[in-house]
C-alpha cells in the first residue's frame, strides 16, 4: 500500500524547445492524471563541459521509480540527457546529479527570475 506520499499537483514548467513546439517557455504546470494514479514532477538537462543546459521540466505521469522521492536526483553516470523525478509540489525547482560511481554531488539552483 502507498503510505504518506507527497501529493503532486503543480510542477515547475520549462521547455527549451518552446518556439518549435509552440508552448510557453517557462512557468507553472498544473498536473492532471487518471484517478488513483500518482503524479510526479521531473527535470531533464544536458551538461556540456560543466555548462548546464535545461531541456524540460514539468509534470510526469505515474512512474514507480519516482515514488517517495522528495528531491529530484539523477544518478546516471554520463547520459546524453540527465533525468530526475520527484513527488511534491514544485519539487523539480532544484535538481541534483549524484552519480552512482560516487563522484561529486552537483546541485543546480534555479536562477532568481520570475516565471513567464
Amino acid at each position: 500500500s502507498g503510505r504518506g506520499e507527497a501529493e503532486t499537483r503543480e510542477c515547475i514548467y520549462y521547455n527549451a524547445n518552446w518556439e518549435l513546439e509552440r508552448t510557453n517557455q517557462s512557468g507553472l504546470e498544473r498536473c492532471e492524471g487518471e484517478q488513483d494514479k500518482r503524479l510526479h514532477c521531473y527535470a531533464s538537462w544536458r551538461n556540456s563541459s560543466g555548462t548546464i543546459e535545461l531541456v524540460k521540466k514539468g509534470c510526469w505521469l505515474d512512474d514507480f521509480n519516482c515514488y517517495d522521492r522528495q528531491e529530484c536526483v539523477a544518478t546516471e553516470e554520463n547520459p546524453q540527457v540527465y533525468f530526475c523525478c520527484c513527488e511534491g509540489n514544485f519539487c523539480n525547482e532544484r535538481f541534483t546529479h549524484l552519480p552512482e560511481a560516487g563522484g561529486p554531488e552537483v546541485t543546480y539552483e534555479p536562477p532568481p527570475t520570475a516565471p513567464t
Epitope: 500500500s1 502507498g2 503510505r3 504518506g4 506520499e5 487518471e34 488513483d36 494514479k37 500518482r38 505521469l61 505515474d62 512512474d63 514507480f64 521509480n65 519516482c66 515514488y67 517517495d68 522521492r69 536526483v73 544518478t75 533525468f83 523525478c85 549524484l98 552512482e100
Partner: antibody, heavy 118, light 111 residues
Framework: EVQLLESGGGLVQPGGSLRLSCAAS????????MSWVRQAPGKGLEWVSS????????YYTDSVKGRFTVSRDNSRNTLYLQMNSLRAEDTAVYYC???????????WGQGTLVTVSS | QTVVTQEPSFSVSPGGTVTLTCGFN?????????PSWYQQTPGQAPRTLIY???TRSSGVPDRFSGSILGNKAALTITGAQADDESDYYC??????????FGGGTKLTVLG
C-alpha cells in the same frame, strides 16, 4: 556491473514460512525501486511485489496480500521478501528485479527456487 | 482484475518478420502503460528487450522494435534468427505500483 543475487529459497511445508533476500551491487540501491517476480514450473512470469526507494510504498499481487511482506535495508543494499502461510501454488523460482524510470525491470537476478510441499 | 493477453505461440521462418502483440481486457494499451518486453530462454532469467513502448534496452539488436498497433502493444522481430527462439513476455504498468505480465508467447523459429 549491476548484480542481483537472490538467496533463501528451499523446501518448506504448506503453512510454513521463508524469507528471501536479494543482495544488490553495482548501482545505488537506495535510489532504485525494486520488485519481486516469480515463475511457477512450466508457467509464465508473474509480478509479486514492489517497493519504492524509501520503502514507504509497497504493493502486492492479490494472491499474496496479507501473507507476503516486502522490505528493504538500504544500508545493507538488500531487498527481502518475507513469505508466510505458504501454499503449494507459491512454488516457483523467485526473481528480484531493479525497477527503472518508465516502470520497467532493467536488471534481473538469477532467481531462487521455493518449493512448497509436504 | 486486469488480464494481459498475448498469443500463446507463434512461428517464423529464419530471416522472416514476426509481430507479437499485447492487449488487455479493460481498454486500449497506450504509452501511459509504459509497455515493456522481455525475452526468456528455458532455465535463464529474463532479459529486457524494449521499454517505454519502443526504446531498445542496452545491447539489444535493432532487429527488435516496439510500437503500439491499434489498441495493443507490439514487439516486431525482423530478420528472425535461430537464437530468437524463446518465450517473450510483455508487461503493462497499471499505475499505483501494479505491474501485470502477459501470459507469454512461445516463439518457434522454423527449420
Amino acid at each position: 556491473e549491476v548484480q542481483l543475487l537472490e538467496s533463501g529459497g528451499g523446501l518448506v511445508q504448506p503453512g510454513g514460512s521463508l524469507r528471501l533476500s536479494c543482495a544488490a551491487s553495482g548501482f545505488t540501491f537506495r535510489n532504485s525501486a525494486m520488485s519481486w517476480v516469480r515463475q511457477a514450473p512450466g508457467k509464465g512470469l508473474e509480478w509479486v511485489s514492489s517497493i519504492s526507494v524509501t520503502g514507504g510504498s509497497t504493493y502486492y499481487t492479490d494472491s499474496v496480500k496479507g501473507r507476503f511482506t516486502v522490505s528493504r535495508d538500504n544500508s545493507r543494499n538488500t531487498l527481502y521478501l518475507q513469505m508466510n502461510s505458504l501454499r503449494a501454488e507459491d512454488t516457483a523460482v523467485y526473481y528480484c528485479a531493479k525497477v527503472y524510470y518508465y516502470s520497467f525491470f532493467d536488471y534481473w537476478g538469477q532467481g531462487t527456487l521455493v518449493t512448497v510441499s509436504s | 482484475q486486469t488480464v494481459v493477453t498475448q498469443e500463446p505461440s507463434f512461428s517464423v521462418s529464419p530471416g522472416g518478420t514476426v509481430t507479437l502483440t499485447c492487449g488487455f481486457n479493460s481498454g486500449s494499451v497506450s504509452t501511459s502503460y509504459y509497455p515493456s518486453w522481455y525475452q526468456q530462454t528455458p532455465g535463464q532469467a529474463p532479459r529486457t528487450l524494449i521499454y517505454n513502448t519502443n526504446t531498445r534496452s542496452s545491447g539489444v539488436p535493432d532487429r527488435f522494435s516496439g510500437s503500439i498497433l491499434g489498441n495493443k502493444a507490439a514487439l516486431t522481430i525482423t530478420g528472425a534468427q535461430a537464437d530468437d527462439e524463446s518465450d517473450y513476455y510483455c508487461v503493462l504498468y497499471m499505475g499505483s505500483g501494479i505491474h501485470v505480465f502477459g501470459g507469454g508467447t512461445k516463439l518457434t523459429v522454423l527449420g
